[in-house]
């Protein structure tokens, strides 16, 4: 297992609709053809794999399971979007990148993006 640098923004503010997007960029030391990206949430004394995707370079990301994430890739960058967030989901979201094929296997873990989510204020009742 070889180490690899992964960069991601320090802070992102989710939209009023609970959507947060950020870029995860990795310094690929070679020509990887199969890449796995995992988003980890570290908060509340827990570590949670929020979503994970494997993709072949140049193809769309295919996310595992009941994913609340979507994403696209471009070169050594992955554009990740997490949906359905609420204030309680505020936390540190860490990008983990694995170069699966061809060997050797590379692993990189970013420092994390602090995502802040603010629940929208309910609209006041109106007679109009």
């Amino acid at each position: 297992c070889k180490a690899m640098h992964v960069a991601q923004p320090a802070v992102v503010l989710a939209s009023s609709r609970g959507i947060a997007s950020f870029v995860c960029e990795y310094a690929s030391p070679g020509k990887a053809t199969e890449v796995r990206v995992t988003v980890l949430r570290q908060a509340d004394s827990q570590v949670t794999e929020v979503c994970a995707a494997t993709y072949m370079m140049g193809n769309e990301l295919t996310f595992l399971d009941d994913s609340i994430c979507t994403g696209t890739s471009s070169g050594n960058q992955v554009n990740l979007t997490i949906q359905g967030l609420r204030a309680m989901d505020t936390g540190l979201y860490i990008c983990k990148v694995e170069l699966m094929y061809p060997p050797p296997y590379y692993l990189g873990i970013g420092n994390g993006t602090q995502i802040y989510v603010i629940d929208p204020e309910p609209c006041p009742d109106s007679d109009f």
């Epitope: 509340d44 399971d65 009941d66 309680m88």
Partner: nanobody
């Protein structure tokens, strides 16, 4: 709801290992996120680990990360908790639970509506 029965608990020495099993019956097992919780004497029930419906995504409490591994076998309707490097503070009754919801960011807070009866794990020095 699903019916859940845990097994595999027991007495083990510090540093030892145990594998807990959770057998499900009833509804379609693969529709449920599965979790493990524990309750030590005189303490509140606490989250240990959870696993998504297909088994591809997992969540762990910081206190067990790197020592415990959660897994599942949908064909057998089973969930498992492999516990290694056990510590005295891991002593508790361990419960498996099922939540009829998709994955998310905070599986410890999912609406687990089915619970097993629990299995005792005692770690001694």
């Amino acid at each position: 709801e699903v019916q859940l029965v845990e097994s595999g608990g027991g007495l083990v020495q510090t540093g030892g290992s145990l594998r807990l099993s959770c057998a499900a019956s009833g509804r379609t097992f693969s529709n449920y996120t599965m979790g493990w919780f524990r309750q030590a004497p005189g303490k509140d029930r606490e989250f240990v680990a959870a696993i998504s419906r297909s088994g591809g995504l997992k969540s762990y409490a910081d206190s067990v990360k790197g020592r415990f591994t959660i897994s599942r076998d949908n064909a057998k309707k089973m969930a498992y908790l492999q516990m290694n490097s056990l510590k005295l503070e891991d002593t508790a009754v361990y419960y498996c639970a099922a939540a009829p919801v998709p994955w998310g960011t905070r599986p410890s807070t999912f609406p687990y509506d089915s619970w097993g009866q629990g299995t005792q794990v005692t770690v001694s020095s």
